[in-house]
């Protein structure tokens, strides 16, 4: 008799990351009987929705359904039909929507309402769309990378199954850079977390974790650039802004109304004698770095130690995974190697920013000009943020690991979010009795 293959006993979950610049849909899969084991959930698909972030649809909310269709259809194709009804779908919106909510709670609610109605039309088990807090974004990113790195597993191994893994169970810190915010999350070494807003307590797999986290709204790479432009145009003598963060020969016209559209530039807003100005790149890393530092207020700190803008930051501890735009930007600049020192990174950035725009366009013909033009700023911003903002040094730089994926799953908050909402991270070791919802993260 022929052996019949038993149907795979697997489960699926979908998380949509509604970021400030785009939306991505992630499909996760895990063996049903191993739900509480660590490291069993993995990503089977990422579908990047074509177009901008959902906050851009504020004036045409009725089109959000059209925008989401292709990736939701992709999910229908990837997940077996028999599993559709039991596959949970979550949408978490991050800093782009936090900013929209700051401008108008009504508009943000309207966008989310249409998102919810659109996603409810699919055959999956839609669980809701919400704007997650910056604290959640940091926490779930930290959970994701440590889950994927096997840090919550109690079994010590003499061999390494994942990159960056040391044999100890010391967790990695998480550094996340988006378009509108950036998060820093880690377990400090025997240090009191002086500000309660930045403290998280978890019990995961039978172990307690005291975690520090902070999300800096307006300090994602796109909003930081708007901030820098708004700051610099204040002191420009006319409608030409000679900008060291863009390549020599680069030119771009910016509408003042676009500059002041975001809440992130409000502190620099002033009446200008022109409606438009032209950015003219001069490509100077050092001057760009200096200009960026002016965005960080380090003159005031009500704690023993601060990052910037009066926000408490404990001394850095252990290794860090830097993901999302930290990774994408450094990957483009070819600076993700563990062997590249901070001094070397700075040297490479100086060379890159000084390259003429025409030369850059030729060298990177397949890259969208809008993105291409901003890598000098973004790379410089990453260095400034990590070194001056978070106080990494040339020595501690080697503890930063620029990570895109771990074991085939993207580093980011979405996996941690799903693990939490599906109760797949038990507080105690899985051998213990089932726990109530309240014992989960």
């Amino acid at each position: 008799t022929q052996n019949k293959a038993l149907p795979e006993n697997v489960k699926y979950g979908i998380v949509l990351d509604a970021g400030s610049s785009h939306t991505s849909l992630y499909i996760y899969k895990w063996p049903a009987e191993k739900e509480n084991d660590t490291g069993v959930v993995h990503q089977v698909e990422e579908c990047r929705v074509k177009g901008p972030g959902i906050s851009k649809f504020v004036q045409k909310v009725n089109e959000i359904g059209i925008y989401l269709t292709d990736c939701m259809e992709r999910a229908r194709e990837v997940i077996p039909r028999s599993q559709h009804q039991e596959t949970p779908v979550y949408l978490g919106a991050t800093a782009g929507m936090r900013l929209l909510r700051m401008e108008s709670e009504e508009l943000a609610d309207r966008v989310l309402d249409v998102v919810e109605r659109s996603l409810s039309n699919y055959p999956f088990d839609f669980q809701g769309a919400r704007i997650i807090t910056g604290q959640e974004e940091g926490a779930y990113g930290w959970i994701t990378i440590n889950y994927l790195l096997g840090k919550f597993s109690q079994k010590t191994r003499w061999f390494s199954i994942v990159p960056y893994e040391t044999n100890n169970q010391e967790t990695f810190g998480a550094l996340d850079l988006g378009g509108a915010s950036t998060q820093v999350t880690f377990v400090p070494q025997n240090q009191t977390i002086e500000s309660p807003d930045n403290a998280l307590q978890f019990r995961l797999y039978g172990k307690d974790y005291n975690v520090y986290t902070h999300s800096f709204l307006c300090y994602g790479k796109d909003q930081a650039l708007w901030q820098k432009l708004a700051k610099d145009i204040q002191v420009a003598s006319n409608e030409i802004l000679r900008d060291p963060c863009f390549h020599p020969g680069y030119k771009k016209v910016v509408n003042v109304s676009d500059l002041y559209k975001t809440p992130c530039t409000k502190r620099f807003e002033m009446t200008l004698p022109f409606q438009q100005f032209e950015i003219q790149g001069i490509g100077n890393y050092q001057q760009c770095h200096q200009s960026i530092l002016e965005l960080f207020n380090t003159s005031y700190c009500p704690y023993s130690q601060c990052a910037f803008n009066g926000i408490f930051l404990p001394p850095l501890q252990g290794d860090f995974g830097a993901f999302s735009a930290f990774y994408f930007v450094m990957k483009f600049l070819n600076l993700t190697s563990e062997k590249v020192s901070q001094e070397k990174v700075t040297e490479m950035m100086k060379k890159f920013c000084a390259q003429p725009w025409e030369e850059i366009k030729t060298s990177y013909a397949g890259v969208k000009e809008k993105y291409l033009s901003e890598y000098c700023f973004s790379g410089t911003y990453i260095l400034s943020l990590l070194l001056q903002g978070y106080h990494f040094t040339a020595d501690s730089w080697e503890h930063i690991h620029f990570i895109g994926k771990i074991q085939g799953s993207d580093a980011g908050w979405t996996l941690g979010y799903m693990l939490n909402l599906t109760n797949m991270i038990p507080a105690e070791q899985p051998l213990s009795t089932p726990l109530s919802h309240s014992t989960y993260v």
Partner: antibody, heavy 121, light 111 residues
């Protein structure tokens, strides 16, 4: 501004193969789908298929599947339509097109100028 | 495959009048609360141009005199008032499911 430049007119014999290119400038093809549409002389439009250049997923009208191949090179922002085992009824103008949402949530459509393919013995 | 039927095949009208073009699908093109019907305009020797997407949304840079309506299987493109550059062939297209099919077209000519 966005431009789609297609390769020049082709005259081919039945049974032969041809590869038509569509070079996009001012836009990254990874950020949208590339569609191919054809129009036989004096006739209506026929949708051939589309590609998502970000992950090379393709979808075809089943009547073109197998004989037609759509590919994309994101490093040069160029999409290709390859036709094999050509027949006289493949004589048509072939268009590449992009449509979708831009960074400001405006729905765009951009078309190539068309490539005339003539299949004749 | 979803078959689209357009009527009339030819429509003769004068400048300033209202044009009403119809497209009927062999089955519903609605899904997930969206009507996946698009309208294109094509002039001789030119590629098509998207006028309306998802039944009623105007394409980028399309004048307000073009409007689309309908759901399920019956859709309409209205042009009012007609201007000289509007005389062309109009195609409907469904994008609910592969293959995305086009209708046979309606020729709008100057009376």
């Amino acid at each position: 501004q966005v431009q789609l430049q297609q390769s020049g007119a082709e005259l081919k014999k039945p049974g032969a193969s041809v590869k038509i290119s569509c070079k996009v400038s001012g836009f990254s093809i990874k950020d949208t789908y590339v569609h191919w549409v054809r129009q036989p002389p004096g006739k209506g439009l026929e949708w051939i298929g589309k590609i998502d250049p970000a992950n090379v997923n393709t979808k075809f009208d089943p009547k073109f599947q197998g004989r037609f191949t759509i590919t994309a090179d994101t490093s040069t922002d160029t999409a290709y339509l390859e036709l094999s085992s050509l027949r006289s009824e493949d004589t048509a103008v072939y268009y590449c097109a992009l449509y979708g949402y831009d960074d400001d949530a405006y729905y765009f459509d951009y078309w190539g100028q068309g490539t005339m393919l003539t299949v004749s013995s | 495959d979803i078959v689209l039927t357009q009527s009339p095949a030819t429509l003769s009208l004068s400048l300033g009048q209202r044009a009403t073009l119809s497209c009927r699908a062999s089955e519903s093109v609605d899904n997930y609360g969206i009507s996946f019907m698009n309208w294109f305009q094509q002039k001789p020797g030119q590629p098509p141009r998207l006028l309306i997407y998802a039944a009623s949304n105007q394409g980028s840079g399309i004048p307000a005199r073009f409007s689309g309506s309908g759901s399920g299987t019956d859709f309409t493109l209205n042009i009012t008032p007609l201007e000289s550059e509007d005389f062309a062939v109009y195609y409907c297209q469904q994008s609910k499911e592969v293959p995305y099919t086009f209708g046979p077209g309606t020729k709008l000519e100057l009376k």
